[in-house]
């Protein structure tokens, strides 16, 4: 697994650097959740060819993964700083069934998966304490959860690896957005 | 092989509108980020706009904002800018070109260039 | 827009000479910053991102550093291909460009 944000070499090689302010925190976050992404996509088109599959839609059929949408206002165009922060915080929060599902999917990188599980609560952690409007942040219910879970392991193997596949695309493309907006708070 | 081909320049009248192309082949713009930069005689580069694969979202210079649009046809596998209300200070090449991966931390692939005249 | 302040504007230097250009950016943007090569009439061309990446078949002449606002680029050692001008251009948001250094022949 890489080394958690703020332990890299660079950060110990230079002692006298400015501690990382909250918004710089957040960004490397983000970005480190990315690499560890991206190892575990290698491992999943390494393994399948789900990566260029164009069956895609029937297994996004039994997926509800959050989406950046024009209205939720993260976009330049439109942007709203607490409308979009409550978006993303939602929108990490729901991601964390499907990133529970992805713990047992993984056979050489299952230590990464884990570390992509537990940064994403810390950022979650990072972007609450940011939040003015903690009220407008759902919850996602834990019982509808469960069935989701339990639902999705009980998927056949190709369904398995197709929701694998998907839920490390969409999120990524998640972080993206998020970051993209972040930089503009 | 991996490039980038545009058309759609010529001389226009201030005021005027023009669209620009810009079509990939070896690789898919549905999972790029897209990028236009422009260069006026003489002048140095200018960043205008680049769009974000992911839901299209575009961002733009203060230049050009709400003049310009930046958009894809992911069927065609190739981006767009339709410049309206242009001005003689929009003259220039305009270069398409790809953001290289995904943070994204510089411009890899670069189109040739097409020249714009804004004149009367 | 982030604004990428590049100097000098020109610089004359000899074959052999160590040259230094630097850029500054308006705000942090962390290690968000390439800078590229370009020759008249042709594209731009990428010498190191990343802030000092060096891309791949570029000569080890070339070095970049700094991070958070200011930014450099070094040629250790000036060859007769490398005249030319050079843009630094940041990629934390949007992708705004340094106003650009002419290296010419002294």
């Known amino acids: 697994a890489p080394v958690p944000p703020g332990e890299d070499s660079k950060d110990v090689a230079a002692p006298h650097r400015q501690p990382l302010t909250s918004s710089e925190r957040i960004d490397k976050q983000i970005r480190y959740i990315l690499d560890g992404i991206s190892a575990l996509r290698k491992e999943t088109c390494n393994k399948s060819n789900m990566c260029e599959s164009s069956k895609e839609a029937l297994a996004e059929n039994n997926l509800n993964l959050p989406k950046m949408a024009e209205k939720d206002g993260c976009f330049q165009s439109g942007f709203n700083e607490e409308t979009c922060l409550v978006k993303i915080i939602t929108g990490l929060l729901e991601f964390e069934v499907y990133l529970e599902y992805l713990q047992n999917r993984f056979e050489s990188s299952e230590e990464q998966a884990r570390a992509v599980q537990m940064s994403t609560k810390v950022l979650i952690q990072f972007l609450q304490k940011k939040a003015k409007n903690l009220d407008a942040i759902t919850t996602p219910d834990p019982t509808t959860n469960a069935s989701l879970l339990t639902k999705l392991q009980a998927q056949n193997q190709w369904l398995q690896d197709m929701t694998t596949h998907l839920i490390l695309r969409s999120f990524k493309e998640f972080l993206q957005s998020s970051l993209r907006a972040l930089r503009q708070m | 092989e991996v490039q980038l081909v545009q058309s759609g320049g010529g001389l226009i009248q201030p005021g005027g509108s023009l669209r620009l192309s810009c079509a990939a082949s070896?690789?898919?713009?549905?999972?790029?980020?897209m990028i236009w930069v422009r260069q006026a005689p003489g002048k140095g580069l200018e960043w205008v706009s680049d769009?974000?694969?992911?839901?299209?979202?575009?961002y733009y210079a203060d230049s050009v904002k709400g003049r310009f649009t930046m958009s894809r046809d992911i069927s065609k596998n190739t981006v767009y800018l339709q410049m309206n209300s242009l001005r003689a200070e929009d003259t220039g090449v305009y270069y398409c070109?790809?953001?290289?991966?995904?943070?994204?931390?510089?411009?890899?692939?670069w189109g040739r260039g097409t020249l714009v005249t804004v004149s009367s | 827009d982030i604004v990428m302040t590049q100097s000098p504007s020109t610089l004359s230097a000899s074959v052999g000479d160590r040259v230094t250009i630097t850029c500054r950016a308006s705000?942090?943007?962390?290690?968000?910053l390439a800078w590229y090569q370009q020759k008249p009439g042709r594209a731009p061309k990428v010498l190191i991102y990343?802030?000092?990446t060096l891309e791949s078949g570029v000569p080890s002449r070339f070095s970049g550093s700094g991070s958070g606002t200011d930014f450099t680029l070094t040629i250790s050692s000036l060859q007769p291909e490398d005249f030319a001008t050079y843009y630094c251009?940041?990629?934390?948001?949007?992708?705004?460009f340094g106003q650009g250094t002419k290296l010419e022949i002294k």
């Open positions: 705000q942090g943007i962390s290690s968000w």
């Open positions: 070109a790809r953001w290289a991966d995904d943070h994204p931390s510089h411009l890899d692939i």
């Open positions: 251009q940041q990629s934390w948001l949007g992708g705004s």
């Open positions: 070896g690789f898919t713009i549905s999972s790029n980020y």
């Open positions: 990343k802030a000092s």
């Open positions: 769009l974000y694969y992911y839901a299209g979202d575009t």
